[in-house]
Amino acid sequence: WPPPGTGDVVVQAPTQVPGFLGDSVTLPCYLQVPNMEVTHVSQLTWARHGESGSMAVFHQTQGPSYSESKRLEFVAARLGAELRNASLRMFGLRVEDEGNYTCLFVTFPQGSRSVDIWLRVLAKPQNTAEVQKVQLTGEPVPMARCVSTGGRPPAQITWHSDLGGMPNTSQVPGFLSGTVTVTSLWILVPSSQVDGKNVTCKVEHESFEKPQLLTVNLTVYYPPEVSISGYDNNWYLGQNEATLTCDARSNPEPTGYNWSTTMGPLPPFAVAQGAQLLIRPVDKPINTTLICNVTNALGARQAELTVQVKEGPPSEHSGISRN
């Protein structure tokens, strides 16, 4: 608000007023009269820049008159009262109401005093974020999508992630005239490491007190990545049972595990139990390559492990799952 003048009447009003599409807004406008100053106000006038005529007038004897009587109203001016408050209420804000307005006091003996106010017509956008479920492509693809619908002015969308990625943002007219829908895609080369990680879409808009943060949990579909654990190269005759585990990461989840050897089916000392393979005690040395084949909706992958059971004392050796 501009500071009051010294020794003269001054019109006080904010330089900019925000209002929401379809709502009502008050354009505040007051005449500041210093203590020792005397003034008489006979008319209050509101006009819009670039348009002919006044949109609203409050006349000392005729009262209020409006260019659109259903949409405008003097908030405080009354016949028979001192005209010091020219504040004007506008109903059913439209996009085309955005612009510069002049509030003017016709005073005596100071003359006309006016101020300009910029009315900003805003529309609060609705924001959504969703994952774009992808498969391994080897090329950058949209992995997340953030949409800010029906904003005025257009919302600003940014992405926050430690995975890298590039945004691709576009705009189209919103459903309501003068509004804009902003769509931002977050693009990255899909990898299994990205699956299940989060990225954040940040939407900023004049109508928000603070930015809106929307988190997206990424989904990458990929065939199984397989490894076998549980063997430490220290298996000896006479030891207790040991267990090998077929470790598989995949999306979607594995649908089946199949154990075999390079020679064909499992030997009698090896018993498959889903993702685990139970190795029973043996009485003679072994040198066998085991295969774990894992299947999911996208395909099958396998891992191999050569297992040796050697002669020697089993007492002090670790690395075997014992009963």
């Epitope: 008319q43 007038v57 000392q60 016709v106 005596f108 003996p109 003359g111």
Partner: antibody
Framework: EVQLVQSGSELKKPGASVKVSCKTS????????MHWVRQPHGKGLEWIGG????????SYNQRFKGRVTITVDKSTSTAYMELSSLRSEDTAVYYC?????????WGQGTLVTVSS | DIQMTQSPSAMSASVGDRVTITCKAS??????VAWYQQKPGQPPKALIY???YRYSGVPDRFSGSGSGTDFTLTISSLQAEDLAEYFC?????????FGQGTKLEIK
């Protein structure tokens, strides 16, 4: 009913002064500024100045500054306009008019003739 | 001072005619313009304030328009009783100034 009743015609010699009165009724005198406008015969209107009865604050047309004095008597709801150092070109009908930004009520006019 | 230039200075029209009088300000006066009607031997009568708003009691055949520097008074259907002189006036800044008048005669 709002009424502004002015004093009668005046014939004055050049160099003299004239004081025209305007008695008001039908409204609250102190709530409206009173102005004076003149009209030479067959010519246009010329604003002279005005006064706010409550404060006594005045505004004058620079063309008349120093020669014109506008006053009020709140007790009788009357406004006065005094013009001094009269010249022949001051011959005109003088109107008082209630100010509402524009002038919504006018007196009937007072003819002031300046002639030697 | 702001000059108010009125045109035409005189015109003659028939009953039922549409009549337009214009007034041009030498600088921007916003919408702070009034129009007056003055019949012979009478004081002026206020018709329009703030460029386009009619005083109560003024017939709706009288209308005003404009803002900035160009203003118009229109009589949509001239009546015999509209024989008069018409003046525009600006009250944007002191000194208040009037147009020189348009004398309207009935044919």
């Amino acid at each position: 009913e709002v009424q502004l009743v002015q004093s009668g015609s005046e014939l004055k010699k050049p160099g003299a002064s004239v004081k025209v009165s305007c008695k008001t009724s039908g409204y609250t005198f102190t709530e409206y500024t009173m102005h004076w406008v003149r009209q030479p015969h067959g010519k246009g209107l010329e604003w002279i100045g005005g006064i706010h009865p409550n404060s006594g604050g005045t505004s004058y047309n620079q063309r008349f500054k120093g020669r014109v004095t506008i006053t009020v008597d709140k007790s009788t709801s009357t406004a006065y306009m005094e013009l001094s150092s009269l010249r022949s070109e001051d011959t005109a009908v003088y109107y008082c008019a209630r100010w509402t930004g524009d002038f919504d009520y006018w007196g009937q006019g007072t003819l002031v003739t300046v002639s030697s | 001072d702001i000059q108010m230039t009125q045109s035409p200075s005189a015109m003659s029209a028939s009953v039922g005619d549409r009549v337009t009088i214009t007034c041009k300000a030498s600088q921007n006066v916003g919408t702070n313009v009034a129009w007056y009607q003055q019949k012979p031997g009478q004081p002026p009568k206020a018709l329009i304030y703030s460029a386009s708003y009619r005083y109560s009691g003024v017939p709706d055949r009288f209308s005003g328009s404009g803002s900035g520097t160009d203003f118009t008074l229109t009589i949509s259907s001239l009546q015999a009783e509209d024989l008069a002189e018409y003046f525009c006036q600006q009250y944007q800044s002191y000194p208040y100034t009037f147009g020189q008048g348009t004398k309207l005669e009935i044919k």
